[in-house]
Amino acid sequence: TLNSVLNSNAIKNLPPPLGGAAGHPGSAVSAAPGILYPGGNKYQTIDNYQPYPCAEDEECGTDEYCASPTRGGDAGVQICLACRKRRKRCMRHAMCCPGNYCKNGICVSSDQNNFRGEIEETITESFGNDHSTLDGYSRRTTLSSKMYHSKGQEGSVCLRSSDCATGLCCARHFWSKICKPVLKEGQVCTKHRRKGSHGLEIFQRCYCGEGLSCRIQKDHHQASNSSRLHTCQRH
């Protein structure tokens, strides 16, 4: 588990898995951009690596993360850097190559400590498979039986979107998974570029509502190095 990284708060039992939101059948939950643990990059770029300017990890490829190329990290200038392989130093999950995650400052295999199981559980749920056992989750958190008698309202805890009332989906919200509203036009959404990254997010958003898609905000006032938002826009 990730307990060793989530280091400074008392947790009686293991926290719910990072991620784990259930989405609309056939549509993955939109999750917030992939910086899970704060801290700028302090590592050098790799030679012969073609720089691509970015504001956040999701703008980079599957095998990349977004960070300052210089030691000490001027956050104003960031480019996509090659992901860090197993046993290399890291400061957040996105820095590690696919199949690995950041634990105690080192990229380790997702196979260790059942972490992969948590991600797979998330992916299974995200595509609306309500028949999944969710063993990794249910052993840790017991929902009130009331949840199954009435559909969850906005902000109430959930395991999957079918637990939530119409117009809501089940999505990760920092400490927990709760029922959140399906997004309306103009609301912030998240477009995923990094494969599987939704399994690591702590702020997940629902999908955009009918007739809407998640696109980058067209705003000429925003500087190119700013963190560009995606919003739900008409097709």
């Epitope: 009686k12 700028g40 929902l143 805890v157 709760i178």
Partner: antibody
Framework: QVQLVESGGGLVQPGGSLRLSCAAS????????MSWVRQAPGKGLEWVSV????????YYADSVKGRFTISRDNSKNTLYLQMNSLRAEDTAVYYC?????????WGQGTLVTVSS | DIALTQPASVSGSPGQSITISCTGT?????????VSWYQQHPGKAPKLMIY???NRPSGVSNRFSGSKSGNTASLTISGLQAEDEADYYC???????????FGGGTKLTVLG
């Protein structure tokens, strides 16, 4: 409608203890995470602690860790904050807040004064 | 530690628009695009006005809107009214300490 009512505040000496309660109504208490947030006189808001819907997870601000304990009784729709080893800097209005999508409902607060 | 910086005070006349800023770092606001805003009148409990950057809870006037660019989130109040005079706090989360974090607060004064 959602209602949160805090009680248990008062004057206490440094090193003393106090237990705050928050009675919840108007929503399914057992389906929501709950939090305590405090505000020192004339100061800003400071998050104190949060507890999961089933009490399995608790988190605390560094400033209160090891001294305060959050708990809840879902059968009584009540949230608690046990405060031990109180210090002058703990003087504040303590708010009980429902943590749905962020702190979406708040009580009116109860004043805790730590002074000799 | 994560710290959210807000101006101590802002002011505006009735009918005007004002904007309150909340500045973090690339590790928090700039990184995970999440911020909420609360309004607090003197002697009253805070009230959630905006969540997830730009979403309004039901019952909150559409004169209140949120946005974010880079490491700075903003709360804009248009058509300023006397009852908008209050303290406003931004809020996000610290993913290392697993805690909620509030900005220092901004006192909004409606002139005249």
């Amino acid at each position: 409608q959602v209602q949160l009512v805090e009680s248990g505040g008062g004057l206490v000496q440094p090193g003393g203890s106090l237990r705050l309660s928050c009675a919840a109504s108007g929503f399914t208490f057992s389906s929501y995470w709950m939090s305590w947030v405090r505000q020192a006189p004339g100061k800003g808001l400071e998050w104190v602690s949060v507890i999961s819907s089933d009490s399995s997870s608790t988190y605390y601000a560094d400033s209160v860790k090891g001294r305060f304990t959050i708990s809840r009784d879902n059968s009584k729709n009540t949230l608690y904050l046990q405060m031990n080893s109180l210090r002058a800097e703990d003087t504040a209005v303590y708010y009980c807040a429902r943590h749905g999508i962020d702190f979406d409902h708040w009580g009116q607060g109860t004043l805790v004064t730590v002074s000799s | 530690d994560i710290a959210l910086t807000q101006p101590a005070s802002v002011s505006g006349s009735p009918g005007q628009s004002i904007t309150i800023s909340c500045t973090g770092t690339s590790s928090d606001l700039g990184g995970y695009n999440y911020v909420s805003w609360y309004q607090q009148h003197p002697g009253k409990a805070p009230k959630l006005m905006i969540y997830d950057v730009n979403n309004r809870p039901s019952g909150v006037s559409n004169r209140f809107s949120g946005s974010k660019s880079g490491n700075t989130a903003s709360l804009t109040i248009s058509g300023l009214q006397a009852e908008d005079e209050a303290d406003y706090y931004c809020q996000t989360y610290d993913q290392i300490k697993l805690s909620a974090v509030f900005g220092g607060g901004t006192k909004l004064t409606v002139l005249g």
